[in-house]
């Protein structure tokens, strides 16, 4: 999805939202793991 039609501003917004959600999930998982390991 790196080129062509996917430069549409709605697609760019959805990509940003997806990345934010993914990072939140990964960081949340790491935080839980850290707390668990303490």
């Amino acid at each position: 999805h790196s080129d062509g039609i996917f430069t549409d501003s709605y697609s760019r917004y959805r990509k940003q939202m997806a990345v934010k959600k993914y990072l939140a999930a990964v960081l949340g998982k790491r935080y839980k793991q850290r707390v668990k390991n303490k």
Partner: antibody
Amino acid sequence: VEESGGRLVTPGTPLTLTCTVSGFSLSSYDMSWVRQAPGKGLEYIGIINTNDDTWYASWVKGRFTISKTSSTTVDLKMTSLTTEDTATYFCARISDAYVFDYAYYFTLWGQGTLVTVSS
Amino acid sequence: ALVMTQTPSSVSAAVGGTVTINCLASQNIYNSLAWYQQKPGQPPKLLIYRASTLASGVSSRFKGSGSGTQFTLTISGVECADAATYYCQQGAGADNIGNPFGGGTEVVVK
């Protein structure tokens, strides 16, 4: 998802349709309006996201405006209506976005509300 | 402009038979395509997304395939309940576009 506000109007009359959602929050999902003229196909109107940003089909040209009026309602304000705008207007929820699939799909639809523009 | 062209506009099938509907995108949309089923007086229902992924609760008789610009919806073991109009939709762009939907294909079951 439920639409309301459709009725018979004369050309040029403004009209506002309302989409009311339950079971989920508009802070979590983008929403869209799609219309269907009698016996015709589906026609995309536009999308409003969780931040209240909007995107429209090229034919809309400022005649229609999508806005959120509460955490459970989305409005479609229509102006300069003509007989060509006679259609069933659907409100639809947009799919979630994922890192490896951020395309958009219409996952949950209301039953639609009929707008008839006639003199 | 990105245009979705659906063929045929109408198709007739016998119960138990197979129906194939085609959707052509004027630009590469990778696998960003959905298929919908609409019965008279009802809203559309999402059948397939990401070109080939079945939506929840949809029969495995429905199969989506293709990528890039050419896509196909195949209905096997056609049942009377499959009589409906089917639409494809590109999910790649929504900003200042014409229409992300194809023109529709009416499936008549004999």
